[in-house]
């Protein structure tokens, strides 16, 4: 027993206060990160607090403003982009959000040499995507689903595509499903390294069924939003990849890149494009049944002005136990010979590791190994490879940055971050300058986040970029909850959990328990990161214990855990939450009559199924924007994990895994169902069907809809949502208001 001096009579203790819901809703304890906008090996741009764009030179220690806040304000710019020849800056204003990544905006081009905006041949508005070439100051942009090219900002545009049509043909930008579930970007065009070629995707959504929902707005009649959205088993977009020579775009026009024969024989997806050199490109393709991926390296044939993808340069990645890759199939990082590459995929023991592929995947050289996973390759230089993993001290929810010396044999490995600020920092990402001359480390916790600048050769810390001093001071008089990350061993499965405990936690007392769940395939909730959020408040002020559990289907602990849910979503994720709750009860400090569960999106699905599990464990629960049947969700995501909803494939489990099928089981729990009516992602249809099934079963429940809100329930809806959920939980747990 460790006796610690009590702070109860300490005068400092009396000034300490619990978190309030208002603190959370106001974002009082939000943190800042610093990601340099690198423009060379030793220079970066950063937008200062007063909105000047400042150039920092690490080696001289000097900085100067290249674009004043006055210029920014003159067009109400919220973002900027410097051309690689440093002659121009685009200024972005009138930001208008579309889906998760996509937005439209108005763009102005400012000439830094003369301090004036470029007049003549101004850009149309609104633009869907705009970017500089990697060299010089060519511009590519997408307007009304067509791609345009400018050799210089003041020049007239050259139109590359002509078939673009709203909701039908998308050029250079993804349709809904590719944006959300495959590319995770707002763009689908890629410049070659020196700007000679421009590659782009064309998505044909002509035959895709459309989801339609009402947007109520303020008018007499609601608008109808129509989105081509392929649900599980439906017709998918047809994708084609083209490449155009940007120096002579009219010469031969766009050239299509051939699809590998083994991919083209049935429905398929394009998953990513990586330029290797100006005349070599790497495309990744995926069968609709997503356990076979093909990486195809293509070369420009000068004589024919076409792209050739020899079968000898096709590399197949196949999974026999699940789907290909983790959440996405990983992308290659090419080495300096422009043919060999580094890539993360499963090793023979079922852990995702870095492999070096020189000729064939079969002859791949494994670079990392162990019962942990390599997560991201940041940079490969002539002599070093930088990557992140969760190896250190065997905590899957940590991220440290490692350097492997690939210039020496045998390669030596060094953890760059493991011992830097060990207590404060256990979850890092990194941002590298050209040739990894310098890099920034961004630490997300578990302590207060901090961003630092480092020398790429010695790893020496040069300076602190952002240490969140104001946040640190603001938290000095706050009673934050205690957090612990531990694991449960159950039937050969390791269940990692994070427990958030009230500030004066006493193991001899009984506390209400709230489970927060996400649980989607290849997700991770138990992470060593800093957060002051709603659940922090519930522990700090309302005295609840909150637990997050990573069960089967979650990531970065090997394929056995990850692929356990393959073709049977909604079973083991729920079982593992229930198992964990039983273990928490055994710990002795949980009031088993006051246990709740809540989740959002996939978490709303899991929380609904847990409430309807018939265990009697949960008194109440909340589902925000839940999936209720996998037949209602997007093809690309759903089929990756569930296969097709056809009789000869997996229709039976699609039917068995719905929330509606368990309507009767909600009779003995208090259920709060919440959804935005303009959810483009998990359609309101999901909650409408749950509500209908509950009504038909004559089961009482509570519900809240948010008019015209999407999957994020942002703005004032957020405040209303968390206030509403707080009241619901306090009532459930018999806590006074």
């Amino acid at each position: 027993i460790v006796l610690r001096p009590s702070r109860v009579h300490n005068s400092e203790e009396n000034t300490m206060r619990a978190l309030t819901l208002k603190d959370i809703l106001n974002g009082t304890f939000s943190y800042k990160t610093f990601f340099p906008n690198w423009i060379s090996g030793q220079e970066y741009l950063h937008q200062s607090a007063d909105n000047n764009i400042v150039l920092y030179n690490i080696e001289t220690g000097q900085s100067y403003t290249i674009l004043s806040n006055r210029t920014m304000k003159s067009v109400n710019a919220s973002n900027y982009g410097l051309s690689p020849d440093r002659q121009f800056v685009y200024l972005e204003s009138d930001y208008s959000k579309l889906w998760r990544y996509s937005y439209t905006a108005t763009y102005y081009i400012y000439d830094l040499s003369n301090g004036e905006f470029v007049r003549g041949n101004e850009l149309p508005r609104p633009i869907q995507y705009l970017c500089w070439s990697p060299v010089g100051s060519k511009l590519a942009y997408v307007y009304q689903n067509n791609i345009y090219l400018k050799q210089r900002p003041g020049d007239p545009p050259f139109q590359i595509t002509f078939n673009g049509r709203e909701n039908k043909i998308f050029n250079g930008i993804p349709d809904w499903v590719y944006e959300e579930e495959m590319l995770a970007t707002k763009y689908a065009l890629w410049w070659s390294p020196n700007g000679k070629f421009l590659a782009y995707a064309e998505f044909n959504d002509t035959d895709i069924p459309v989801i339609a929902y009402s947007y109520y707005g303020d008018e007499q009649y609601p608008r109808t939003i129509n989105i081509p959205y392929p649900k599980a088993g439906a017709k998918n977009p047809v994708v084609r990849i083209f490449i155009i020579d940007t120096t002579y775009p009219a010469y031969v026009g766009p050239q299509e890149v051939p699809v590998p024969a083994m991919i083209a024989s049935s429905d398929y997806y394009f998953s990513w494009l990586t330029w290797v050199t100006d005349e070599r490109v790497c495309l990744q393709w995926l069968k609709r049944v997503q356990n076979v991926s093909v990486l195809s390296i293509c070369d420009f044939r000068e004589d024919w002005q076409t792209w050739d993808c020899p079968k000898t340069q096709e590399h197949i990645e196949e999974s026999r136990t699940g789907w290909a890759g983790g959440f996405f199939v990983s992308t290659p990082v090419f080495s300096y010979d422009a043919i060999s590459y580094y890539k993360i995929f499963s090793d023979k023991d079922g852990y995702k590791h870095i492999h070096y592929i020189k000729d064939t995947v079969e002859n791949a050289i494994q670079i990392t190994s162990g019962k942990w996973e390599a997560i991201n390759i940041f940079r490969v230089t002539q002599d070093s490879l930088f990557y992140s993993s969760n190896e250190f001290e065997e905590y899957p929810g940590r991220r440290n940055i490692y350097r492997i010396s690939i210039g020496s044999y045998p390669p030596s490995k060094k953890c760059v971050t493991c011992h830097l600020r060990k207590e404060r920092c256990q979850y890092y990402t990194a941002s590298f300058s050209d040739y990894a001359k310098y890099y920034a480390l961004v630490c997300y916790g578990p302590g207060i986040p901090i961003s630092t600048l480092h020398d790429g050769r010695t790893d020496q810390e040069i300076k602190i970029l952002e240490e969140n001093k104001e946040l640190e001071n603001a938290l000095k008089n706050i009673q934050l909850p205690k957090e612990e990350i531990k694991k449960l061993e159950v039937d050969e499965i390791t269940l990692w959990y994070k427990m958030i405990l009230p500030p004066q936690f006493d193991r001899s007392k009984k506390y209400p328990l709230l489970i927060q769940v996400y649980g989607g395939p290849c997700s991770q909730s138990v992470r060593s990161v800093f957060a002051v959020n709603w659940i922090s408040y519930l522990a700090s002020k309302e005295g609840m214990v909150i637990a997050l559990v990573d069960g089967r289907g979650t990531a970065f602990q090997g394929d056995k855990l990850l692929y356990a849910v393959y073709r049977k979503l909604g079973v083991y994720e729920v079982e593992d939450q229930i198992t964990a709750v039983r273990k928490f009860i055994e710990m002795g400090f949980i009031d088993e009559k006051r246990i709740a569960i809540w989740g959002w999106s996939y978490g709303g699905y899991v929380s609904s199924l847990a409430l309807a599990s018939g265990t009697g464990l949960f008194k109440c629960g909340i589902a925000v924007a839940p999936v209720s049947s996998w037949e209602y969700y997007a093809s690309v995501y759903t089929e990756r994990f569930m296969g097709l909803p056809t009789k000869d494939d997996n229709l039976e489990h699609y039917k068995n895994s719905t929330v509606m099928a368990r309507a009767e089981y909600f009779r003995n729990v208090d259920y709060l169902l919440i959804h935005g009516t303009a959810d483009d992602n998990v359609h309101f249809q999901n909650s409408a069907q749950i509500a209908k099934a509950l009504v038909n079963a004559q089961v009482d429940f509570q519900a809240m809809w948010y008019s015209d809100q999407n999957h994020g329930l942002s703005g004032l809806s957020t405040n209303h949502l968390y206030t509403h959920m707080t009241h619901f939980l306090k009532q459930c747990f018999s806590l006074s208001d």
């Epitope: 090996g41 030793q42 080696e59 000097q62 100067y64 403003t65 290249i66 440093r86 830094l112 040499s113």
Partner: nanobody, 117 residues
């Protein structure tokens, strides 16, 4: 205080050559990206060429193949070798950081280049 002193301009016939120099003081030239800019009468100033701290040159379209930017870090000087000059190249040539500072930054007097027969 950073100071920039350009020299080497003059009158030259079309097709001729000039080598401009820019002496830099008050900063470590070797660590800064530097650029040459020009301003013709009644026209806005425009960028001509830039050089990174690693010595890599970048050029605007009209300068490619005719102009060469270089640096001598020991002498704290940046150069612009201009060949095959045309009457259109007539302007006052300035050097500065690349990109230049905003507002009313330090610009030297510049050096006048006149291409005429």
């Amino acid at each position: 205080q950073v100071q920039l002193q350009e020299s080497g301009g003059g009158l030259v016939q079309p097709g001729g050559s000039l080598r401009l120099s820019c002496a830099v003081s008050g900063t470590m030239l070797s660590r800064n990206a530097m650029g040459w800019y020009r301003q013709a009468p009644g026209k806005p100033r425009q960028w001509v060429a830039g050089i990174t701290s690693d010595g890599l040159g970048n050029y605007v379209g009209f300068a490619k193949g005719r102009f060469t930017i270089s640096r001598d870090n020991a002498k704290n000087t940046v150069y612009l070798q201009m060949n095959t000059l045309k009457p259109d190249d007539t302007a006052v040539y300035h050097c500065n950081f690349w990109p230049p500072p905003s507002g009313r930054p330090i610009w030297g007097q510049g050096t006048q280049v006149t291409v005429s027969s």
